[in-house]
């Protein structure tokens, strides 16, 4: 058993049929010695008396808020949560496996630049009695600070018969060094509590590996005289690291016909313009990627040829 | 060419070669990008590699003030990786494919390090840890880790030279 926060404790349980329960001794936080009684949750029934209460925690029915009282006055509370371990593996019932980029990916994170700011998100089908708490650091043995905000519900989607909820959190490295080569990964730890179930999820990454630039901005077409060719121009996204002479991007320009089956013409360039042939009803799209490190491409920025 | 004492390197040549290094490092093992090698337990090799750190002056401001600190750090790293790529980690079993870009990568590392430091001028270099993994699978894992680390190193070096070429060239 360990303390998650003040008056909230996590009991770690082996979750198999013939596992013994965990013996837990609750102590009433009071200088009083006599006349103390214990209750659980909303029930007024007395579960025991005395300054300590020894319980066996085996089921979710044994978890909850234990309260000690004296003469009708509440003295203290202890909320017990359960953390299940099945076949030596901690349960992951609360969050959905996103399976990208690999199985058992519960947290996904992205950064728009090298400033040390990043966003993580996760999915669940649970709509109520759910809380998240996020902590982060750079490195784990001698951790350096990363400050995370509160996790918020960022999207709701209907997937078949189920509703899916996306939560996200923004974090900022306290002393980020955008130009340095990272040697210690960022660690992100999410505590999830659903009713009386506690779970924790972790992700470890380098900012460089989760970079995904915003799409190029101000995408414009300039027809070239007496030609089907057009000059496409664009600019670096506002959110990208500066100076651009140092934090450079490379771009992919694509001409796509109306039908998905039509052949796509693609051009790769380090410049912020390119000359392409504009077909009727086609569209021109441009996306960006770090020039020197193959992290994710941005989403496409598009304009119609006409 | 860089010259002793603190003259500028051939920024544009260094830029071109470092960008080529980036391409080669990723083509040497593109799949490396999708493998989470940190799960495999960090071995001394990848812990001991020279990283370009915050105080090394490789940021735009540091380069403007005095690029020599950063260039020395980059040179150290290039020599370190060049030696690793020439060691039995890469020459031993399992053999690299004949068309593997590792050979080119090795040569380019040497080329860039020579651009930074001509004969007769010596910067302090870092000691290479003696590594001789016994099992072929250990060697394979080590290769992945070294290449993954190299990808990050050459990306920073390429940024330095691109910025230098754009802003510090005479």
């Amino acid at each position: 058993i360990w303390e998650l926060k003040k008056d909230v404790y996590v009991v770690e349980l082996d979750w198999y049929p013939d596992a013994p329960g965990e013996m837990v001794v609750l102590t009433c936080d009071t200088p009083e010695e006599d006349g103390i009684t214990w209750t659980l949750d909303q029930s007024s029934e007395v579960l025991g008396s005395g300054k300590t209460l020894t319980i066996q925690v085996k089921e979710f029915g044994d978890a909850g808020q234990y309260t000690c009282h004296k003469g009708g006055e509440v003295l203290s509370h202890s909320l017990l949560l359960l953390h299940k371990k099945e076949d030596g593996i901690w349960s992951t019932d609360i969050l959905k496996d996103q399976k990208e980029p690999k199985n058992k990916t519960f947290l996904r994170c992205e950064a728009k630049n090298y400033s040390g700011r990043f966003t993580c998100w996760w999915l669940t089908t649970i709509s109520t009695d759910l809380t998240f708490s996020v902590k982060s650091s750079r490195g784990s043995s001698d951790p350096q600070g990363v400050t995370c905000g509160a996790a918020t519900l960022s999207a709701e989607r209907v997937r078949g018969d189920n509703k899916e909820y996306e939560y996200s959190v923004e974090c900022q490295e306290d002393s980020a060094c955008p130009a340095a080569e990272e040697s210690l990964p960022i660690e992100v730890m999410v505590d999830a509590v659903h009713k009386l179930k506690y779970e924790n999820y972790t992700s470890s990454f380098f900012i460089r590996d989760i970079i995904k630039p915003d799409p190029p901005k101000n995408l414009q077409l300039k027809p070239l005289k007496n030609s089907r060719q057009v000059e496409v121009s664009w600019e670096y996204p506002d959110t990208w690291s500066t100076p651009h002479s140092y934090f450079s991007l490379t771009f992919c320009v694509q001409v796509q016909g109306k039908s998905k089956r039509e052949k796509k013409d693609r051009v790769f360039t380090d410049k912020t313009s390119a000359t392409v042939i504009c077909r009727k009803n086609a569209s021109i799209s441009v996306r960006a990627q770090d020039r020197y490190y193959s992290s994710s491409w941005s989403e496409w920025a598009s304009v119609p040829c006409s | 060419r860089a010259v002793p004492g603190g003259s500028s390197p051939a920024w544009t040549q260094c830029q071109q070669l470092s960008q080529k290094l980036c391409t080669l490092a990723w083509s040497a093992h593109p799949l490396v990008g999708h493998m989470d090698l940190r799960e495999e337990g960090d071995e001394e090799t990848t812990n001991d590699v020279p990283h370009i750190q915050c105080g090394d002056g490789c940021d735009p401001q540091g380069l403007r003030d005095n690029s020599q600190f950063c260039l020395q750090r980059i040179h150290q790293g290039l020599i370190f990786y060049e030696k690793l790529l020439g060691s039995d980690i890469f020459t031993g079993e399992p053999s690299l494919l004949p068309d593997s870009p590792v050979g080119q990568l090795h040569a380019s590392l040497l080329g860039l390090s020579q651009l930074l430091q001509p004969e007769g001028h010596h910067w302090e270099t870092q000691q290479i840890p003696s590594l001789s993994p016994s099992q072929p699978w250990q060697r394979l894992l080590l290769r992945f880790k070294i290449l993954r680390s190299l990808q990050a190193f050459v990306a920073v070096a390429a940024r330095v030279f691109a910025h230098g070429a754009a802003t510090l060239s005479p």
Epitope: D18, P20, S43, L47, F60, D62 | -
Partner: antibody
Framework: EVQLVQSGAEVKKPGESLKISCQSS????????IGWVRQMPGQGLEWIGI????????RYNPMFRGQVTMSVDKSSSTAYLQWSSLKASDTAMYYC????????????WGQGTMVTVSS | EIVLTQSPATLSASPGERATISCRAS??????LAWYQQKPGQAPRSLIY???NLQSGIPARFSGSGSGTDFTLTISSLEPEDFAVYYC?????????FGQGTRLEIK
């Protein structure tokens, strides 16, 4: 006052189905799991299983798994034990009981339902 | 599953006497053992839980002791209403199991 009131005695033929009930009152129904115990004529007590009234989480005695089904209706604070096809060997007194949280034993018992299966 | 063996199967005693019933587990159940009393035609009633804790409303002449595999229920001075069948139950490991029962009869 805590009370567990069980449905009346049943006489059934082999192969028939049956559902007996146990209505709780006088306490917070969702705080306490409900269990069932069998006592065959002239024999001792046998633990059938327990069930959470919150989310219908169930722990069956392997000996009874597939033989009986436990269920619960939160809205009426009632627990059920049912058989889809009775056998003569199901003849027994069935008790529902309230599981004490933080312990696991039964602190309050229903009066019992006698089930007789005979052709 | 854990087997609980009660002894004796039958105990004859007189009112006012001290009665002791033993319960032995086939493996350790820590202190997670309860004692119940059952009278003819009635449901069982909880007497002792966690090996030695008296259930609310139960007279103080009933007491329990033991831990691990050996447990004892003691009635310090028998009253006429104490003659019944007594069962021990372990609730440490599923499936929870009962002892076979001890009949306490008037001598």
């Amino acid at each position: 006052e805590v009370q567990l009131v069980q449905s009346g005695a049943e006489v059934k033929k082999p192969g028939e189905s049956l559902k007996i009930s146990c209505q709780s009152s006088g306490y917070s129904f969702t705080t306490y799991w409900i269990g069932w115990v069998r006592q065959m004529p002239g024999q001792g007590l046998e633990w059938i299983g327990i069930m959470s009234p919150v989310d219908s989480d169930i722990r069956y005695n392997p000996m009874f798994r597939g033989q009986v089904t436990m269920s619960v209706d939160k809205s009426s604070s009632t627990a059920y034990l049912q058989w889809s096809s009775l056998k003569a060997s199901d003849t027994a007194m069935y008790y529902c009981a309230r599981r004490r949280p933080g312990q696991g034993y039964f602190d309050f018992w229903g009066q019992g339902t006698m089930v007789t299966v005979s052709s | 599953e854990i087997v609980l063996t009660q002894s004796p199967a039958t105990l004859s005693a007189s009112p006012g006497e001290r009665a002791t019933i033993s319960c032995r587990a086939s493996q350790s159940v820590s202190s997670w053992l309860a004692w119940y009393q059952q009278k003819p035609g009635q449901a069982p009633r909880s007497l002792i839980y966690a090996a030695s804790n008296l259930q609310s409303g139960i007279p103080a002449r009933f007491s329990g002791s033991g831990s691990g595999t050996d447990f004892t229920l003691t009635i310090s001075s028998l009253e006429p209403e104490d003659f019944a069948v007594y069962y021990c139950q372990q609730y440490n490991i599923y499936p929870f199991t009962f002892g076979q029962g001890t009949r306490l009869e008037i001598k």
